[in-house]
Interface confidence: low
């Protein structure tokens, strides 16, 4: 037999030769970070063939690293299901903890024995400085140094110093989440007012006031004979803007050129139709209505328009 | 590996401001936070504050509220710390380390001095 | 706050024998987790100060094994073994619990 087969789990004892006579049998021993597990056999003989009889490293088995058990609040987890060397063990935390440490430890194999690669990590509470303080408002446990993983703060605005009030745009409640990062950026408190929105040929029909602030919402519809050109539901936006923009009353014109209507007062504007003159966004005439200025429409009132400060 | 460079020696009057740069490198610079030292000469370590290098949270120490303003560039690793008013006690040497709150200052900076004098 | 002695403030020592310092607070630094927040670091002279031992008893990486940390609560101490010229300077103790406070310091000297 030419020479014996080579394992990765182990090794010949003693010194190959360049061949072996029938019947010679050669003994294996396993090799260092391995060790054996009987009843396996670990030897072999040069066959009549001139082939040696099957033997495998089956028998010897990695050395393993100690047993590491979960940190608290958190998990142990080897990669692999296994505490054998060349293998990783991942750490974990529990939803409101991070780890302290090495995520990954290595079991490595150092002479003879297998040992990590570092001390096992631990889960601590998730934690948060304190949130952003802001210009013009302030947060509920002020006096707080640390927050804890769900430890919530809300936002309120200052009393303003001017006759119109601070606004909280945003979300005024935040909480300590993971990574210690707070759930979303901190609010602002501003001053926000939009102007008094006129719509010519048509009246506000809620959202009364003065004033308009955040969030302030108003709603609209034309006189008869004219159809709104836009939304009918305005809300005061964060930039002192209405959004969607304050809609206009556009006359209804007749649906051809060829004669005018018989009526000379304004189209009717009943609900249940859906005619171009319908106050709510129907479908419209299917050609834009010229855009004038008829002489004689009543002005907004001086001073209606609410300048912003 | 990890290394915390800082900025060189300052000398201000008092009522000045001073800006302290600390650069990073050897690790991820948003996965940690740097927390900011001071020595004063001769004696022990003050801790001054700390900065999220990930979101830019910052938790400073009660005495210098007010004064003092940490800050981070991501896109360069570095992180800052001002301290505004200068007074003749604010002469130390002044560190910056990496660490969360709760946990170990395994890295430093080199230190920088400040020195405030009329 | 959470104030943090330590004793002796100067400890004069001889290469190759063991020294010992201690370190209080003034509340105790043991955590529900079962750690304690507590630090030792190193400065030596001309140099910044390095992490010794963290959570009360672990050597950080690279710390020679002369170097050990014990105590729980509010007393803890920090022992080496057999002292070395190289481990001269000033020993602060810290805790990292309640933000952080550093004890005054223990200078370290050869006889």
């Known amino acids: 037999c030419e020479e014996p087969p080579t394992f990765e789990a182990m090794e010949l004892i003693g010194k190959p030769k360049p061949y072996y006579e029938i019947g010679e049998r050669v003994d294996y021993k396993c090799k260092k970070g391995y060790f054996y597990i009987p009843p396996l056999a670990t030897h072999t003989i040069c066959d009549r063939n001139h082939t040696w009889l099957p033997v495998s490293d089956d028998a010897c088995y990695r050395e393993t690293c100690p047993y590491i058990r979960d940190p608290l609040n958190g998990q142990a987890v080897p990669a692999n299901g296994t505490y054998e060397f060349g293998y990783q063990m991942h750490f974990i935390c529990n939803e409101g903890y991070y780890l302290i440490g090495e995520e990954i430890l290595y079991c490595e194999l150092k002479g003879s024995v297998a040992i990590w690669s570092g001390k096992p990590p631990i889960c601590e509470k998730v934690l948060c400085t304190p949130p952003p303080k802001i210009k013009n408002g302030k947060h509920t446990f002020s006096e707080v140094e640390v927050f804890e993983y769900l430890d919530a703060v809300t936002y309120s605005c200052d009393p303003a110093p001017g006759p119109d009030p601070f606004s909280l745009i945003g979300e005024s409640t935040i909480y300590c989440g993971d990574n210690s990062v707070w759930s979303r950026a901190a609010p602002e408190c501003k001053v926000v007012k939009c102007r008094f929105p006129v719509v010519e040929n048509g009246k506000q029909i809620s959202g009364f006031g003065k004033k308009f602030y955040y969030k302030a919402t108003v709603m609209f519809e034309c006189d008869k004979g004219f159809y709104l050109d836009g939304s009918d539901t305005i809300v005061c936006d964060s930039n002192s803007t209405w959004d969607p923009p304050v809609p206009k009353c556009l006359k209804v014109l007749p649906p051809s050129s060829t004669k005018p209507p018989a009526l000379s007062h304004s189209v009717s504007t009943s609900s249940t139709t859906k005619s171009p003159a319908s106050s709510a966004s129907g479908p419209r005439p299917t050609y834009k209505p010229p855009v004038s200025n008829y002489p004689g429409y009543p002005k907004p009132e001086e001073g209606i328009l609410d300048s912003l400060d | 590996q990890v290394q915390l460079v800082q900025s060189g020696a300052e000398v201000k009057k008092p009522g000045a401001s001073v800006k302290v740069s600390c650069k990073a490198s050897?690790?991820?610079?948003?996965?940690?936070?740097i927390s900011w030292v001071r020595q004063a000469p001769g004696q022990g370590l003050e801790w001054m504050g700390w900065i999220s290098a990930y979101n830019g949270n910052t938790n400073y120490a009660q005495k210098l509220q007010g004064r003092v303003t940490m800050t981070t560039d991501t896109s360069t690793s570095t992180a800052y710390m001002e301290l505004r008013s200068l007074r003749s006690d604010d002469t130390a040497v002044y560190y910056c380390?990496?660490?969360?709150?709760?946990?170990?200052?395994?890295?430093w900076g080199q230190g920088t001095l400040v020195t405030v004098s009329s | 706050d959470i104030v943090m002695t330590q004793s002796p403030l100067s400890l004069p020592v001889t290469p190759g024998e063991p020294a010992s310092i201690s370190c209080r607070s003034s509340?105790?630094?043991?955590?529900?987790?079962?750690?304690?927040?507590l630090d030792w670091y190193l400065q030596k002279p001309g140099q910044s100060p390095q992490l010794l031992i963290y959570?009360?008893?672990n050597r950080a990486s690279g710390v020679p094994d002369r170097f050990s940390g014990s105590g729980s609560g509010t007393d803890f101490t920090l022992k080496i073994s057999r002292v070395e010229a190289e481990d001269v300077g000033v020993y602060y103790c810290m805790q990292a619990l309640q933000t952080f406070t550093f004890g005054p310091g223990t200078k370290v000297e050869i006889k």
């Open positions: 959570l009360g008893s």
């Open positions: 050897g690790y991820t610079f948003t996965s940690y936070g």
């Open positions: 380390a990496r660490g969360f709150p709760r946990t170990s200052f395994d890295s």
């Open positions: 509340q105790s630094l043991l955590h529900s987790n079962g750690y304690n927040y």
